[in-house]
Interface confidence: medium
């Protein structure tokens, strides 16, 4: 005799009882009415299951909650099914068996026929697991049912001192969808919140779960697929304060079926959004956008932000959204990089783009900007990177495209190409009034507009000039004079330790900032406008340093241990971290601080010049870093502002030395023998280079490196020209993310050394 192998299969669901109504007492598990009604309903459910062929497999069941409307009973039951039958008893099959029994004319005296008028249409059966029941049971001491009326904003109170885990069972009118809003109110917490697209905490119906206070998403809104949601709040540590505010609404379904006709121009023409953007998209999302283009000369570009598309095998589900574009199936995924999907136009009837959520797990709403591009020349003067659809500078010595094709087959790399014979000459020799090319082509068209390219400067009127680095050099090169605007910058005031450094004199580096918490120097920074200081994003990565309120910014400072008349201090009103900043890779290591009041410029306080995207900092050039950082690896911060000259290093050698962990947003500088370098406490401080005009331009921000001043490992800096578009966007009020390697990598911030 061999015992039959069985598996416990858990089902969760709900049914509606048409001849009963919900009362407030039934919403409280501790009430006598609840206990009595749930016992009767559980018996009814048991009888219903037992009267079908499932009866022989019945193990146990529970009715754990009641809901509004005709009385809705929420339940689970367990069947012990023979192993070989496990796959045949899907939730759909089980529902069918139960519905058939409810509709049958059998003359049973069971309560589901005599006492309860069960609505067969309203029966819901979902797959669950033993673990789901464990989670559910752990919350039953703090189980809260709430019906969310239209127009009502219902606040949800957190677990009290006695309970560590609570479950809200949320229900709204059937034709509406539940939307939960979560807003973090504290910097540090260990709480977990999970939201489910079901009445109970079913793992397979998880929409999203969050752990700890997320600075990336200080406010998040999450949509269910319909009128039911479960929210589990698990407390992480003893606290008298809720670390976030939770509230819930019932909202109407929003349509996302759109027909658009684009105009024959190349700038951004609009955006497509998932319903209730920036809310998380709903598990039931299905959007269909039809875009018509004016002619086949154009292709359609979809510009994504921190989200990208890639091909996926047909048998694999898309976990972060499925896209169907011209019969191509693509899966979305979140990424800390920009991305564009380019759709070549082959038919004049345009293109249909479908976006669908394939699973209950969702993510932040998706917003896509759309524009047209010229199919015959998609990236004028630049290189089209097929990996990410972006136009990137070509042949500038920096591999912007992940496959490096932008730096392949270059006649001249990071140099000017003579028209006569394709000879390469160094960029500073272009438009310097001395012919270097055979027929002097390097000195032609220096006073007129030229096609835009990697090293051409783009004027405000969008025309381009050939002269490299024409900004603020005292000569008007743009027709509209825009190269000489915003030039109150980069001049030393009273010009007369960093590792290997020397002491600076007062006013020598008037843009230098000291970023402090409670009187302690943490990071450097640079003044770039009358209310803005730039620094490194990694200075704020620890939870205890994330709030702008904590920081004081000192300008015009010389010594850390004393104040002098030339220095001024500011509080920080807003902090912007680059949205693509990644702690592990150090990529996009830049942040902007908005000061609480404008700076009055003086001999000791004035901004550094910001470079244009096309500004060329030549490898081999000597530039300077300044800061109060440690003067030796592991040493204390310096009292007096230190300065040191470093040499800019070509990207290819830099990348080789750091085993290809150097991104295009990074720049290297230093010395082969080490000795001169930035160190802890210098983080975010400026790497500045002097142009022939005498003005100083910001080339980099102290970011990371292997040790300090170590031989054969130079300092790595954030390459300002690669993040300048984001900087300008934030400075002009266009947003950004406003909100509150190798084994010895360190961040050059005194608080962070790993």
């Amino acid at each position: 005799y061999k015992a039959e192998v069985t598996v416990s299969q858990v089902y969760s669901g709900s049914l509606r009882v048409l001849n009963r109504h919900f009362s407030q007492d039934l919403g409280r598990r501790e009430s006598i009415a609840f206990r009595s009604e749930s016992a009767k309903a559980q018996k009814m459910l048991q009888e219903l299951v037992a009267s079908t062929r499932l009866g022989t497999y019945y193990n146990s069941s529970s009715v754990y909650s009641f809901g509004e409307g005709p009385l809705t009973c929420f339940f689970w039951f367990i069947l012990d099914i023979p192993e070989y039958q496990r796959l045949t008893l899907s939730p759909e099959v089980v529902r069918e068996l139960l519905v058939d029994e409810l509709l049958s004319n059998s003359s049973t005296l069971a309560s589901y026929k005599t006492e309860y008028e069960v609505d067969p249409e309203g029966l819901v059966i979902l797959e669950a697991s033993v673990n789901d029941i464990v989670v559910l049971n752990s919350t039953l001491g703090c189980y809260r049912y709430s019906y969310v009326n239209p127009g009502q904003v219902l606040p949800l109170k957190g677990p009290d001192q006695q309970t560590t885990s609570c479950l809200w069972h949320l229900q709204g009118p059937e034709d509406l969808m539940i939307k939960v809003r979560l807003e973090w109110t504290r910097v540090d917490c260990r709480d977990r919140v999970a939201m489910y697209d079901a009445a109970g905490p079913l793992e397979k119906r998880l929409i999203t779960s969050v752990y700890g206070c997320s600075r990336q998403e200080p406010v998040m809104e999450v949509l269910a697929s319909g009128s039911v949601m479960a929210v589990v709040w698990k407390k992480g540590m003893h606290s008298y304060y809720d670390p976030f505010l939770l509230s819930v609404k019932s909202v109407a379904f929003q349509d996302c079926q759109v027909n658009l006709t684009l105009e024959g121009r190349l700038d951004t023409q609009g955006f497509l959004r998932t319903p209730y953007y920036p809310s998380y998209y709903s598990p039931s999302t299905h959007c269909s956008w039809h875009l018509t283009v004016p002619s086949l000369d154009y292709g359609l570009a979809l510009w994504f932000d921190a989200y990208a598309l890639r091909r996926q095998k047909y048998n694999r589900l898309c976990t972060q959204g499925q896209w169907m574009i011209q019969n191509r199936r693509l899966c979305g995924f979140r990424t800390l990089q920009p991305y564009a999907e380019r759709i070549p136009m082959v038919a004049s009837d345009g293109v249909t783009i479908n976006f669908t959520s394939q699973i209950s797990l969702t993510g932040p709403g998706v917003q896509v900007y759309y524009s047209l591009y010229n199919q015959s020349d998609p990236c004028p003067g630049e290189f089209l990177c097929s990996v990410n659809g972006l136009c990137v500078p070509a042949c500038d010595g920096i591999k912007d495209c992940p496959n490096g094709l932008d730096e392949r087959n270059c006649v001249c790399r990071a140099m000017f190409q003579c028209q006569e014979d394709s000879t390469c000459i160094s960029l500073p020799r272009v438009c310097d009034r001395q012919p270097d090319c055979l027929n002097g082509s390097d000195e032609e068209q220096c006073q007129e507009g030229v096609p835009c390219g990697t090293f051409t400067f783009q004027c405000e009127d969008r025309s381009c000039v050939k002269k490299p680095n024409p900004e603020c050099d005292g000569q008007s090169d743009c027709r509209d004079g825009s190269d000489e605007q915003h030039c109150d910058c980069g001049l030393q005031g009273l010009s007369s330790r960093i590792v290997g450094g020397t002491v600076s004199s007062e006013g020598e580096w008037p843009w230098q900032a000291s970023l402090q918490i409670r009187g302690r120097h943490i990071c450097g920074g640079a003044l770039i406008a009358d209310r803005w200081v730039i620094t490194a994003a990694h200075c704020f990565q620890e939870d205890s340093m994330a709030s702008p309120k904590l920081w004081t910014v000192f300008l015009g400072k010389m010594r850390q241990n004393s104040r002098w008349p030339g220095e001024v201090s500011f509080k920080v009103s807003r902090l912007f971290l680059h949205p693509y900043h990644e702690e592990d890779s150090h990529d996009y290591d830049v942040a902007l601080l908005q000061l609480d009041h404008p700076v009055v410029y003086s001999a000791t306080v004035r901004p550094v010049c910001l470079p244009a995207r096309s500004h060329f900092f030549e490898p081999g050039q000597h530039c300077w870093i300044t800061g109060w950082g440690a003067q030796r690896e592991g040493g204390p911060v310096s009292n007096t502002l230190q300065k040191v000259d470093v040499q800019l290093v070509p990207q290819d050698l830099c990348s080789e030395a750091y085993r290809y962990q150097v991104s295009p947003r990074m720049l290297c500088a230093g010395y082969r023998k080490g000795k001169k370098d930035a160190c802890q406490g210098d983080s975010g401080g400026p790497l500045v280079c002097r142009e022939p005009s005498g003005r100083w331009f910001l080339a980099g921000l102290v970011s990371w490196g292997l040790g300090c001043g170590r031989p054969n490992f130079f300092g790595v800096y954030t390459r300002v020209t690669r993040v300048i578009n984001w900087i300008q966007q934030v400075l002009t009020g266009g947003g950004g993310s406003g909100g509150g390697g190798s084994h010895h990598h360190h961040h050059h911030g005194s608080h962070h050394h790993h």
């Epitope: 392949r408 290819d652 050698l653 010395y671 082969r672």
Partner: antibody, heavy 124, light 111 residues
Framework: EVQLVESGGGLVQPGRSLRLSCAAS????????MYWVRQGPGKGLEWVSG????????GYADAVKGRFTISRDNAKNVLYLQMNSLRPEDTALYYC?????????????????WGQGTTVTVSS | QSALTQPPSASGSPGQSVTISCTGT?????????VSWYQQHPDKAPKVMIY???KRPSGVPDRFSGSKSGNTASLTVSGLQAEDEADYYC??????????FGGGTKLTVLG
């Protein structure tokens, strides 16, 4: 006066070993990357090996990899080339050369000071 | 790594210009701007004339100039003089801590 003087060359049978030395004077030896370059009879220059100032970065030409070892003694201002498993095609005048501008972080991979060379003949 | 390709010989009369080419690949000359040129007189050690494609060390006459286009670098000697007669070698960094030389070009000053 900046000077590099090679020594240690001579006649050697195939398969045997030889060690070349290069004595440096007139400059701060440990500021510079150093190289060995050879020139076969009636032939062109061929780069052999290079070593960083503190010996932590080393490169070899494919033709000598696994047989030759470059090293330096900064205390004595001497560069070495240990040549094992010598072949007739290793016969050449071996030059020791210094990398330009040794204080900069990165190499220009350019040799601005050369010795007069030492002759190595591999023959049975 | 294979040697860079140079023409075996080049010639010109005094006062004329002569250009010597040096062709590599997209992994050496084409990728790095670390091209150097050396002059070697018979029985003498080489002397650097150009480094980083077009930079001249101090003491080298400005008659010598270097350039690069794609995978090919060039050395131009203008106003040719008798003492310029020598062998000329190009070299390039080739990545992975390796340097590669050209086969050499014998420059003859005619007359």
């Amino acid at each position: 006066e900046v000077q590099l003087v090679e020594s240690g060359g001579g006649l050697v049978q195939p398969g045997r070993s030889l060690r070349l030395s290069c004595a440096a004077s007139g400059f701060t030896f440990d500021d510079h990357v150093m190289y060995w370059v050879r020139q076969g009879p009636g032939k062109g220059l061929e780069w052999v090996s290079g070593i960083s100032w503190n010996s932590d970065t080393i490169g070899y030409a494919d033709a000598v990899k696994g047989r030759f070892t470059i090293s330096r003694d900064n205390a004595k201002n001497v560069l070495y080339l240990q040549m094992n498993s010598l072949r007739p095609e290793d016969t050449a005048l071996y030059y020791c050369a210094r990398e330009k501008d040794g204080d900069f972080y990165y190499n220009y991979f350019v040799m601005d000071v050369w010795g007069q060379g030492t002759t190595v003949t591999v023959s049975s | 790594q294979s040697a860079l390709t140079q023409p075996p010989s080049a010639s010109g009369s005094p006062g004329q210009s002569v250009t010597i080419s040096c062709t590599g690949t997209s992994s050496d000359v084409g990728f790095y701007n670390f091209v150097s040129w050396y002059q070697q007189h018979p029985d003498k050690a080489p002397k650097v004339m150009i480094y980083e494609v077009s930079k001249r060390p101090s003491g080298v006459p400005d008659r010598f100039s270097g350039s690069k286009s794609g995978n090919t670098a060039s050395l131009t000697v203008s106003g040719l003089q008798a003492e310029d007669e020598a062998d000329y070698y190009c070299s390039s960094y080739a990545g992975s801590n390796k340097v590669v030389f050209g086969g050499g070009t014998k420059l003859t000053v005619l007359g």
